[in-house]
């Protein structure tokens, strides 16, 4: 079954290469187990950047190799992606799955365009 997912249209990463955004889903029921996946759509590719499963009220547990961290509050997930560089600029899509209890619901956001600007190197001081 389909579910609405909202996320910001644009986010600018910090000078330290960190981008944060909220992914909010309209839960049709009382889900106890939720899976959140961040997809990057760019360069003619789709990449699962990170994924986490969590029980409502608990911390997000991300899969290995994750460059993401996050917290949940109700039907909102606060996602942070770290270590970004200019070449990582792209459309980052939030995918939410309500895993348990049945029925299964799937929602995919329209994506957040994350812009990353590499910092200028500090000039040498005399």
């Amino acid at each position: 079954k389909a579910m609405h997912v909202a996320q910001p249209a644009v986010v600018l990463a910090s000078s330290r290469g960190i981008a944060s955004f909220v992914c909010e889903y309209a839960s049709p029921g009382k889900a106890t187990e939720v899976r959140v996946t961040v997809l990057r759509q760019a360069d003619s590719q789709v990449t699962e950047v990170c994924a986490a499963t969590y029980m409502m009220g608990n911390e997000l547990t991300f899969l290995d190799d994750s460059i993401c961290t996050g917290t949940s509050s109700g039907n909102q997930v606060n996602l942070t992606i770290q270590g970004l560089r200019a070449m990582d600029t792209g459309l980052y899509i939030c995918k939410v799955e309500l895993m348990y209890p049945p029925p299964y619901y799937l929602g995919i956001g329209n994506g957040t365009q994350i812009y990353v600007i590499d910092p200028e190197p500090c000039p040498d001081s005399d």
């Epitope: 990449t47 699962e48 899969l63 290995d64 190799d65 970004l84």
Partner: nanobody
């Protein structure tokens, strides 16, 4: 480096399926991000798919999304590429590759330092 040997290529009709295998040896397989690439005649090497060290995260080229599935079996040191709904544009030599790096946003650009010899896939119309 890890040694890689591909198998499973062949000739198939349009709409058919093939499953490519990549056998690894020499190093701890689970420490490597695995990728599949292909080179069609007269074209540059092209990224096809990649999978994280645990197998939990994947990436696909738009051209194969929904048709190809990458997977891995760390216990048996194997990587796989299931290819369905093949068409003549998929004709190429397919290479398995290993990158000793963690996952990120652009696995197609990882430094893959180990490559197999390739296996030919021909899709006839």
């Amino acid at each position: 480096e890890v040694q890689l040997v591909e198998s499973g290529g062949g000739v198939v009709q349009t709409g058919g399926s093939l499953r490519l295998s990549c056998a690894a040896s020499g190093r701890t397989f689970s420490m490597y991000t695995m990728g599949w690439f292909r080179r069609a005649p007269g074209k540059d090497r092209e990224f096809v798919a990649a999978i994280s060290r645990s197998g939990g995260l994947k990436a696909y080229a738009d051209s194969v999304l929904g048709r190809f599935t990458i997977s891995r079996d760390n216990a048996n040191e194997m990587a796989y590429l299931q290819m369905n709904s093949l068409n003549p544009e998929d004709t190429a030599v397919y290479y398995c590759a290993a990158a000793p790096v963690p996952w990120g946003t652009r696995p197609s650009h990882f430094t893959y330092d180990s490559w197999g010899q390739g296996t030919q896939v021909t899709v006839s119309s």
